[in-house]
Amino acid sequence: QERRFQLEGPESLTVQEGLCVLVPCRLPTTLPASYYGYGYWFLEGADVPVATNDPDEEVQEETRGRFHLLWDPRRKNCSLSIRDARRRDNAAYFFRLKSKWMKYGYTSSKLSVRVMALTHRPNISIPGTLESGHPSNLTCSVPWVCEQGTPPIFSWMSAAPTSLGPRTTQSSVLTITPRPQDHSTNLTCQVTFPGAGVTMERTIQLNVSYAPQKVAISIFQGNSAAFKILQNTSSLPVLEGQALRLLCDADGNPPAHLSWFQGFPALNATPISNTGVLELPQVGSAEEGDFTCRAQHPLGSLQISLSLFVHWKPEGRAGGV
């Protein structure tokens, strides 16, 4: 003989794969205080329970260790705790109260559990700026994970030199020592929920601050093709009266400030151009000598020089006859 009672709350609950959900259940108020029995949660249509407090009863292999009956008859609590939710848990469940000493039991109404795809993704937090050569701690966190679930596995992937910092159930710390070449590369934190076999990842692009490593000058001479110098050049022959365009470029992040100087400048010298471009419309004696491009950056500066040697046109040097 069965007595029916209604589960309080919604008729269905939604949980994301790998996470936890509590199916609320309160024992019927009509239950006599003297009623002594065991509680069983069943999957609709099954005769082996998914969770019970009966030590003599087997539970389903699929739910063992993940489904727990939170049994507290004094507080009328018969709730079902589900952790590491799996797609296969998507079903209707009901609670049954049975007693070996009483001639009747209690059966609850059904409640549907809907298991959805995991849409949450890990968060990656970076404190301040990443600076080349300086260790920084990045944290990958999954604050939406429930404490009672199987701890997730954190996995990191970075091209930069790294080492592992501390971890908790909900987060993992990575110490990264980025290099200039790691700027704009991707870093991935992946989180796997082994209890449910679900994997999520988040990928971010690293923004690494670094001083200029390379500075170069491209030289545009008249209509001839440009050529590039990558190191200090002792002497570059130029024809008198020729137009010359010197283009300086450097790496560095954020971009270095480029400026041109005549000669070898002191630190506080005044530039002849405040950009990376130096236009010499007509090369003459005033332009003979050294020109320096300086790439200035908060993390360090770099400069490159070239020396112009002016070839005079024969008629330009001849006196009047």
Epitope: I153, S155, A159, P194
Partner: antibody
Amino acid sequence: EVMLVESGGGLVKPGGSLKLSCAASGFSFSTYVMSWVRQTPEKRLEWVASISGGGSNTYYPDSVKGRFTISRDNAKNTLYLQMSSLRSEDTALYYCARREVVVYWYFDVWGTGTTVTVSS
Amino acid sequence: DIQMTQSPASLSVSVGETVTITCRASENIYSNLAWYQQKQGKSPQLLVFSAKNLADGVPSRFGGSGSGTQYSLKINSLQSEDFGTYYCQHFWGTPLTFGAGTKLELK
């Protein structure tokens, strides 16, 4: 038993293409960063490519960047390496390798290898 | 890129001897170093990671040590199954690079 089995190797002309596969079994494939490492005829080991567990992140050395593409199909537990614009220096025994699970770039499981020969 | 220089290139030894293989990195790799063993016709197998930790199932006669740029692998009381080629590999950022290998041959 954890296993990695490569296939798809063969003889190809310079400039040609080839796609290698690696079938994984015995472990949770999607949890791991996977890589390709090759061994030259001179027995030197060279890292070729790596891919994150979910496939959103890939890395290559300069020697193959722009020519090789690593990918994975987690539903099939399979890793791939698409090689194009092949050169004679790509001739090698190609291994599929599993990276340690958390962060460090060493390889705790290696496949048996598949041979790629680039020759005219 | 970090260069890994392994020495010696080859070594002729007898069973029962103790051997040491060294690996030098072109810059500090902060113990981010692995050692692999490769037997003839087989795939490499992880022996040591993070300079000194033995991989699962590796006999205790193997030992890794070192720091900074200098690392070594020591094999005490060499057994017949230890013959083969040994490689070091740094994992202090990419690109990952390997040493050229040290071939252990039976004297």
